[in-house]
């Protein structure tokens, strides 16, 4: 939240962002480093072992509000943080999984950070 | 709260084969990815395998598809792996583990021997 | 697959000191790396995930860095029962893959 007089201009961006790629580069990518005209995401979820997999890369300006929106999907722990503030910002996202629904334990849920 | 309980050993003959359980108990048992570890002394830790209690889909390490498969038995909340054709080789204990994003618990451990 | 080196077998400690234990992928694998505690005659205790989370009830002491190939878990003021067995273990693809450990003993 801003503060009283505290300017709230935008800081500007780079015009076209480089991001950190990890299974999300493109073939032309050179150093797991991806470019494009919109966001740079981190996205942690279970994969189909329950390992808490992260991959990263880019989102075209095209639908990306949409995509950074991280709208919850039933019966799926999936968390997405963006960013545009700087090149290779996705390095310092650290989305969290979302906690598990209370049916999933049968002695009560288990607490978690 | 969760947790799986292991028998702590089994002695067996080479080439017989042998059947651990993992007892879950404190979760839905159908809601967690159940793994399976390998573990000799001064010979670290191996992955063998996992299954998806609910849909009974299994993942195995290539190396162990032809020497460990994966069951599991929903009633009793239990996932099992037969180990076959046993060898000196296969004695070590073997930890299963459940699994579900931020929520990693393992079993006691079985020490398996195989000894004439 | 995946070979996870941990060059260090053995680190030697005192009681209230900071140390790193290491962990070197053949390839890159992201952030997608855990690591495990284990005392002798126990099962293995999950620490971190993903590299840099830990996981509930971990003390704060323990934290873990890094991506691509290289990954550090830091012990900070260690304590006694610290003192165990660290092993990092990759799950970016598969066969999952661990190191050989690295044993925390008292200097």
């Known amino acids: 939240k801003k503060e009283d007089g505290e300017s709230t201009a935008p800081t500007p961006r780079p015009k076209i962002l480089r991001c950190k790629c990890h299974h999300h580069c493109p073939e032309d990518s050179v150093n797991n480093i991806c470019s494009t005209d919109g966001y740079c995401f981190t996205m942690i979820e279970e994969d189909d072992s329950g390992m808490p997999v992260v991959t990263s890369g880019c989102l075209g300006l095209e639908g990306s509000d949409f995509q950074c929106r991280d709208t919850p999907i039933p019966h799926q722990r999936r968390s997405i943080e963006c960013c545009t503030e700087r090149n290779e910002c996705n390095k310092d996202l650290h989305p969290t999984l979302p906690p598990l629904k209370n049916r999933d334990f049968v002695d009560g849920p288990i607490h978690h950070k | 709260q969760v947790q799986l309980q292991q028998p702590g050993a089994e002695l067996v003959k080479p080439g017989a084969s042998v059947k651990l359980s993992c007892k879950a108990s404190?979760?839905?048992?159908?809601?967690?990815?159940m793994h399976w570890v390998k573990q000799r002394p001064g010979r670290g830790l191996e992955w063998i395998g996992r299954?998806?209690?609910?849909?009974?889909?299994?993942k195995y390490n290539e190396k162990f598809k032809s020497k460990a498969t994966l069951t599991v038995d929903k009633p009793s909340s239990t996932a099992c792996m037969q180990l076959s054709s046993l060898t000196s080789e296969d004695s070590a204990v073997y930890y299963c583990?459940?699994?579900?994003?931020?929520?990693?618990?393992w079993g006691t451990g079985t020490t398996v021997t195989v000894s004439s | 697959d995946i070979v996870m080196t941990q060059s260090q077998k053995f680190m030697s400690t005192s009681v209230g000191d900071r140390v790193s234990v290491t962990c070197k992928a053949s390839?890159?694998?992201?952030?997608?790396v855990f690591w495990y505690q284990q005392k002798p005659g126990q099962s293995p205790k999950a620490l971190i995930y993903?590299?840099?989370y830990r996981y509930s009830g971990v003390p704060d002491r323990f934290t873990g860095s890094g991506s691509g190939t290289d990954f550090t878990l830091t012990i900070s003021n260690v304590q006694s029962e610290d003192l165990a067995d660290y092993f990092c273990?990759?799950?970016?693809?598969?066969?999952?893959?661990f190191g050989d450990g690295t044993k925390l003993e008292l200097r």
């Open positions: 299954i998806d209690p609910n849909s009974g889909g299994t």
């Open positions: 273990q990759q799950y970016d693809s598969y066969p999952l893959t």
């Open positions: 993903a590299a840099s």
């Open positions: 390839q890159n694998v992201g952030t997608n």
């Open positions: 404190g979760y839905t048992f159908t809601t967690y990815w």
């Open positions: 583990a459940s699994r579900r994003g931020d929520i990693d618990v």
